[in-house]
Amino acid sequence: FERTRSLQDPCSNCPAGTFCDNNRNQICSPCPPNSFSSAGGQRTCDICRQCKGVFRTRKECSSTSNAECDCTPGFHCLGAGCSMCEQDCKQGQELTKKGCKDCCFGTFNDQKRGICRPWTNCSLDGKSVLVNGTKERDVVCGPSPADLSPGASSVTPPAPAREPGHSPQ
């Protein structure tokens, strides 16, 4: 059936970049300016996406493919095909409806986008805090407190065989 239809349907011969013009005896006409058809056999061309305002053009529209947008500096893409632009913030901040706000104490964000996340709880892994967290950086967990005997360096050299009573790290 498909082969029969293609033999009878002159529109199936219209390549990408054209449309089957019913007003002109189903002749293949080029897509008008600012429109495209990405597949053959189309009866209309699609309007090109316009990248304006918060959007800027990453790839121009052609007769066979749509324009592609990204976001103007200061904003970043969200969604499939950069359907939205969202404001950048500084590291140590997150975006809210009130704009960019500093991360609360105990949370951090090391990127220009996304939300503030809680610092790692080192004690859950039986470790101690080696470097304190900031708004921009997570804490760095170090050896377990048991491994740090009084006066011992926090960066320990290769240890000799463990004494009885010490559990492995």
Epitope: V54, F75, G79, S83, M84, C85, E86, T96, K97
Partner: nanobody
């Protein structure tokens, strides 16, 4: 077709005032957060202010608080930005934008914006 068209820009002296307008068409204006953003010459885009669907929530970037007022008229499908006590650093192209469907829930993306209107503050 969804469209936003800004107007009202121009040349104004420091300390002066301007009122920008944004005419919306092709969508249910009263269902969306609306936003003003601006781009100063040679700078990145900056969020200026936003307003929720019924106008009961309004937020501003610190640098314009107390000087700029965002408002909307849902009956006229219009968004406004009243700018008072203008400064040289307010010189920019101002864009009106529509918040995405999930704006204020998890993301703060804008899915449509206009061509912009130019504001120049100079003596």
């Amino acid at each position: 077709e969804v469209q936003l068209v800004e107007s009202g820009g121009g040349l104004v002296q420091p300390g002066g005032s301007l009122r920008l307008s944004c005419a919306a068409s092709g969508f249910t204006f009263s269902s969306y957060w609306m936003i003003w953003v601006r781009q100063a010459p040679g700078k990145g885009l900056e969020w200026v202010a936003n307003i929720n669907q019924d106008g009961s929530e309004k937020y501003y970037v610190d640098s314009v608080k107390g000087r700029f007022t965002i408002s909307r008229d849902n009956a006229k499908n219009s968004l406004y930005l009243q700018m008072n006590s203008l400064r040289a650093e307010d010189t920019a192209v101002y864009y009106c934008a529509r918040g995405g469907d999930d704006y204020s829930n998890s993301h703060y993306g804008m899915d449509v914006s206009g061509q912009g209107t130019t504001v120049t503050v100079s003596s």
